[in-house]
């Protein structure tokens, strides 16, 4: 039996160290590149094998980037994005956030706040 | 997954001219960073030429500059090779290329690795 599906919502620091290929994973979005409907941020669209975020492990295809070294990533366009990356030097700081999916119970459970019914 | 179709490859003389077309599959074409590629017989992949996802920035193999002209239309899903002034080294099988958004490192675009998805490739013969 299918269930309703929802989103756990997380956020985490993540702290990479740049590798000899840089930090090894591509984005997409941006206030000229929207790649979620009504959302202009910052999206993992690609890690590659072997680089630094790989290695690491805990960024993840999907994760919506918040910020680089505290600097926000809100109202950005595409290529300003990604020359913020290139440049932010050896050390980078990622505040990132998972959107995990969950199952929510068999369909016919109505739980509080289900629009139906 | 991303279907590429290539077409546009044939037969034709020195000095001559093709337009070689790369259709993608996907909704988000317009994410999309791409390449042509190139194969001679008993060679290996060669890199052509890139486009970033709107066609603002594009980089080209030195053997080609001047002659090849990469484009996109996200509106059609496409990607072209216009291949210009074509010398019988230009023979080889051309591949299109997508990566899915744009890398944070800088440019490493001639790398096949850097690329998530191929066509079956178009041959071009210059006689």
């Known amino acids: 039996m299918n269930g309703r599906v929802d989103y756990l919502v997380t956020e985490e620091e993540i702290n990479l160290t740049r590798g000899p290929s840089g930090l090894g994973f591509n984005i997409v979005g941006g206030t000229d590149q929207q790649y979620v409907s009504n959302d202009s941020g910052i999206y993992v669209s690609r890690i590659k094998e072997n680089g630094a975020a790989a290695l690491d492990g805990r960024l993840q295809e999907g994760d919506k980037i918040l910020s680089v070294n505290g600097q926000d990533l809100k109202n950005l366009l595409h290529q300003d994005a990604v020359d913020l990356f290139r440049n932010a030097g050896y050390a980078v700081s990622l505040r990132v956030q998972h959107r995990l999916q969950v199952q929510n119970g068999p369909i016919g459970h109505r739980g509080e706040g289900d629009p139906s019914g | 997954q991303v279907q590429l179709v290539e077409s546009g490859g044939g037969l034709v003389q020195a000095g001559g001219s093709l337009r070689l077309s790369c259709v993608a599959s996907?909704?988000?074409?317009?994410?999309?960073?791409m390449g042509w590629f190139r194969q001679a017989p008993g060679k290996e992949r060669e890199f052509v030429a890139h486009i970033g996802w709107s066609g603002s920035s594009t980089y080209y193999a030195d053997s080609v500059k001047g002659r090849f002209t990469i484009s996109r239309d996200n509106a059609k899903n496409t990607m072209y090779l216009q291949m210009n002034s074509l010398k019988p080294e230009d023979t080889a099988v051309y591949y299109c290329?997508?990566?899915?958004?744009?890398?944070?490192?800088?440019?490493?675009?001639?790398?096949?690795?850097?690329?998530?998805?191929w066509g079956q490739g178009t041959q071009v013969t210059v006689s």
């Open positions: 290329a997508v990566a899915i958004g744009s890398p944070v490192d800088s440019n490493r675009h001639s790398d096949p690795l850097e690329y998530d998805y």
């Open positions: 996907g909704r988000t074409f317009s994410t999309y960073t």
